[in-house]
């Protein structure tokens, strides 16, 4: 008779997790008798996944019936393959004996498991930054075999081409994963930009998955300050107005101070938003011309979303005609423009620095 | 290792029933055909049926088909044939043997159960 | 069906000596290069034991002293040099069709 050879026809097999895998293993001989016995690996520290005589193999089940006469298919079909299956297995003959002896092996087939990508998570700075400043957004997927796969970074549907990419491990694993950190400068229109970050792989069949970000949770837009003034009134009071514009996110707080005494504070809420995401609002202060001697410095103080106090002050001229009604020279914008000492304390209550 | 469990001696009536056992160890007892031969005092071997225990598949001996029936009990790894109608020539040693190569030979062979049909 | 028949029905060998039992069917055993004879042992109280499958391989643990030959039709089982362990009854079984055995043969030995 001719010498037995145990022939494993795939030197590879790929199945996609939760699939079913077939490891084909046929012997060119019924000599000598003994069993089949499936190892994954080689060497003392081998696997057994099935053993023809012996054992419970839930999830394996032989190709052919065992006891079909003259049996010499000993292929087997391994249920829910998961990553973890992944490895080169080996259909290994047997001779009877007490123990069986082995007698030859086949030449391995090595299991592959496709697994697909988690969605990809994507993550923004921790601390907003403003305009033409740099952030990073990390992107985040796991569990996914084989090891190529590709990522692309976009900006409301632009391609991005500032980010650093690495698969992890960088050797042999049963599954990868990819981190990706992408620097996206910010502009004033950011409020409603998105950043996606785009995952292709060769288990989505085309379809890449998406993770996204919106720019509004990374960015703020400091606002711009300015006074106007309406002409003095019949009763001597001056209403001054102070527009806070183009700022995001809506959390500001404003300080009206005459003469350096806090005469008012508000709390920023329900503002409508503008095209571009931002906000505007617009606080008054009536003033009482004839309660001062002196012309009245008032200052518009405005801190948003923590960041150190923007002042804007005008002067309300007291002396020139004070009764007369729709005189422009009764009020004088001075133009200054201050950001408050960043070295100011936490708590000083003129800043209520922590009102959310 | 394979052992094959069978019951030493059983006496029955004649035109009485007997079910005999062989409680299979060692081995998954789904994967290897189960047969009985039957071997009388002084006499040869004759080979009376098998049974694959994954499926129930049988097979007989024509001169057996009345006779015997063989049945498994997969929870309990146990194959069993019953002999019916017995007569004095049914007094015999009844062996249970499996098939480990799958080539309708017989490997491993219980000790045998000596069946006494007497009145 | 396929009938066997084995001769001698008997025989005696001094120890050492070459004991051959021949297996006849009736019509051949062999199949896709294969030949489906089996021999076993039978010593007195004792289930058989299998000795050689598919006409010449040897079973696990069996002394090289047996040995098998024979296709087709014609079948031979040897014993050399004979020894006192050896002195059982000889079956032939065929597995071409359904299972059958031969008369048996008893071995004796002077």
């Known amino acids: 008779e001719e010498e037995l050879q145990v022939i494993q026809p795939e030197k590879s097999v790929s199945v996609a997790a939760g699939e079913s895998a077939t490891l084909n293993c046929t012997a060119t001989s019924l000599i000598p008798v003994g069993p089949i016995q499936w190892f994954r690996g080689v060497g003392p520290g081998r696997e057994l996944i099935y053993h023809q005589k012996e054992g419970h193999f839930p999830r394996v089940t032989p190709v052919s019936d065992p006891t079909k006469r003259n049996n010499m298919d000993f292929s087997i079909r391994i249920s829910n393959i998961t990553p973890a299956d992944a490895g080169t297995y080996y259909c290994v003959k047997f001779r009877k004996g007490s123990p069986d002896v082995e007698l030859k092996s086949g030449a391995g087939t090595e299991l592959s498991v496709r697994a697909k990508p988690s969605a990809p998570v994507v993550s923004g700075p921790a601390v907003r930054a403003t305009a033409e400043h740099t952030v990073s957004f990390t992107c985040e997927s796991h569990g996914f075999s084989p090891r190529d796969i590709t990522l692309k970074w976009f900006k409301n549907g632009n391609e991005l081409s500032d980010f650093q990419t690495n698969v992890d491990p960088a050797g042999k694993s049963v599954s990868y994963s990819i981190r990706s950190t992408a620097r996206v400068v910010l502009t004033r229109r950011d409020v409603h930009s998105q950043v996606i970050c785009e995952v292709a792989h060769v288990t989505l069949q085309g379809d890449p998955l998406r993770g996204t970000a919106n720019l509004s949770e990374a960015i703020r837009v400091p606002p711009f300050l300015e006074f106007t003034q309406q002409s003095m009134r019949a009763d001597n009071q001056v209403n001054v107005t102070c527009q806070v514009m183009k700022f995001y996110p809506q959390r500001l707080q404003l300080t009206w101070l005459e003469n350096g005494n806090v005469s008012r504070t508000e709390m920023a809420s329900a503002l409508p938003e503008n095209k571009d995401g931002t906000y505007n609002w617009t606080s008054w202060l009536l003033v009482n011309v004839s309660a001062h001697r002196d012309d009245v410095k008032l200052t518009c103080q405005v801190e948003h979303d923590g960041q150190p106090a923007v002042n804007k002050s005008f002067s309300v001229k007291v002396s020139a005609h004070p009764k007369e009604q729709g005189s422009n020279t009764a009020a004088e914008n001075t133009g200054t423009n201050e950001r408050g000492s960043s070295d100011y304390k936490d708590d000083d209550d003129k800043h209520h620095h922590h009102h959310h | 290792q394979v052992q094959l469990q069978q019951p030493g001696t059983e006496l029955v009536r004649p035109g009485a029933s007997v079910k005999l056992s062989c409680k299979a160890s060692?081995?998954?007892?789904?994967?290897?055909?189960i047969n009985w031969v039957k071997q009388r005092p002084g006499q040869g071997l004759e080979w009376i049926a098998m049974?694959?225990?994954?499926?129930?598949?049988?097979h007989y001996n024509q001169i057996f088909k009345d006779k015997a029936t063989l049945t498994v009990d997969k929870s309990s790894n146990t194959a069993y044939m019953q002999l019916s109608s017995l007569t004095s020539g049914d007094s015999a040693v009844y062996y249970c043997a499996m098939d480990y190569g799958s080539l309708y030979a017989m490997d491993y062979w219980g000790r045998g159960t000596s069946v006494t049909v007497s009145s | 069906d396929i009938v066997l028949t084995q001769s001698p029905a008997s025989l005696a060998v001094s120890l050492g000596q070459r004991a051959t039992i021949s297996c006849r069917a009736s019509k051949s055993v062999s199949s896709s290069g294969y030949n489906y004879i089996f021999w076993y042992q039978q010593k007195p109280g004792q289930p058989p034991k299998l000795l050689i499958y598919?006409?010449?391989n040897l079973d696990s643990g069996v002394p090289a002293r047996f040995s098998g030959s024979g296709s087709g039709t014609d079948f031979t089982l040897n014993i050399h040099p004979v020894e006192e362990e050896d002195a059982a009854t000889y079956y032939c079984q065929h597995s071409r069709e359904l299972p059958t055995f031969g008369g048996g043969t008893k071995l004796e030995i002077k």
């Open positions: 049974i694959d225990p994954s499926d129930s598949e049988t």
């Open positions: 060692g081995y998954t007892f789904t994967n290897y055909w």
């Open positions: 598919l006409a010449s």
